[in-house]
């Protein structure tokens, strides 16, 4: 007799999830000498322990604490790049500007990037059929709690000037409900962070508007200023040229506005 299984609204666990996490861990620790001490089997065991046999709507930050401990990594606090709704460009940027870090450039972020996972209460099975959707099912699901936990800690670690890349093509350039807007903004530490600098990335080639005057950017400025952190904003009119100039800053065309 087949066991009844909870049907959730979101996609199920990414296929070959255990193998993927383990392989990513091995790859990351090989590339980053400062993380060579990490035991990837222990990392997988801690990751698994955070959600296996637990109700996927009842996950807490404490569930991830053993994983957080194993993944402890010193990130240069003044080289942190946050992003919202523009992950690919942010990652392209840090691949070129190697001394800057997005969350996904850390071991913990790299392990989970683009993956979905959940278990079932009282069984050791991984649910490959469906997982809870944040809106339709519950917010305390394994994936959402993981990203909330690591995002909060990443923001806490930041100091000096923190950069955030925002998508100027979205109706809400700054969205209070995004991970950046709901978690990271509120966990920047005013004792350490002097300035939040927003980079608004333009989508259209002929778009010459000053998107730093957008009402949602003004809202971000207000939130940040109330936290005693300075705010600055730059338009990135040509993201392709922006990346090219990061690669080749001496290029003569890189002195003009990008």
């Amino acid at each position: 007799v087949p066991r009844w299984r909870q049907q959730w609204s979101g996609p199920g666990t990414t296929k070959r999830f255990p193998e993927t996490v383990l392989a990513r861990c091995v790859k990351y620790t090989e590339i980053h000498p400062e993380m060579r001490h990490v035991d990837c089997q222990s990392v997988w065991d801690a990751f698994k322990g955070a959600f296996i046999s637990k109700h996927p709507c009842n996950i807490t930050e404490e569930d991830y604490q053993p994983l957080m401990k194993l993944g402890t990594q010193t990130v240069p606090c003044n080289k942190i790049l946050l992003w919202s709704r523009i992950k690919d460009l942010a990652h392209q940027f840090t691949q070129v500007q190697r001394d800057m870090f997005t969350l996904e450039d850390t071991l913990l972020g790299y392990l989970a990037d683009d993956l979905t996972w959940c278990g079932e209460f009282n069984t050791s099975k991984i649910n490959y059929q469906s997982c809870p959707d944040w809106r339709k099912d519950c917010s305390n699901n394994p994936v959402s709690v993981f990203w909330k936990t690591v995002s909060r800690r990443f923001a806490e670690a930041a100091c000096d000037v923190v950069h955030v890349m925002l998508n100027g093509s979205r109706s809400k350039i700054f969205d209070k409900n995004s991970t950046f807007g709901s978690v990271e903004v509120h966990n920047l530490q005013p004792e350490k962070v002097q300035t939040l600098e927003a980079w608004v990335i333009h989508g259209g080639r002929e778009d010459s508007r000053d998107l730093c005057q957008d009402p949602t950017i003004k809202e971000l400025e207000s939130i940040i200023s109330k936290r005693n952190i300075q705010f600055s904003c730059k338009n990135i009119y040509r993201p392709d040229k922006f990346l090219q100039c990061v690669k080749n800053p001496e290029d003569s065309s890189c002195t003009s506005e990008i």
Epitope: T60, E62, M68, T72, Q73, V150, A157, Q189, E191
Partner: nanobody
Framework: QVQLQESGGGLVQPGGSLRLSCGAT????????MGWYRQAPGKQRELVAE???????NYADSVKGRFTISRDNAKNTVYLQMNSLNPEDTAVYYC??????????WGQGTQVTVSS
Amino acid sequence: QVQLQESGGGLVQPGGSLRLSCGATGIIFSINDMGWYRQAPGKQRELVAEITRGGSTNYADSVKGRFTISRDNAKNTVYLQMNSLNPEDTAVYYCNAAHTFSGSFWGQGTQVTVSS
């Protein structure tokens, strides 16, 4: 940077008690784990007890039921109440504070000697 300062060590008779304290100063962010480690002469440093930001605790088997770790998040301070001390507990006790993306920080250590 974060500095950790331990206090409360000393000489105590077998069966006695001590309470260690460790305060974190400097640029204080929300530290995730705080804990106590110890190192006896000629031995490796070992975990004694640790406590997460949420209050979950973990103890070495050798101290379970005798030692209690607690934490005051507002003061960024961690305590170790040590009861029923025996000579095997003699060591330098180190405080540790860790943040997932800022690394691990250590105190200078405080000597605990259990002897009659």
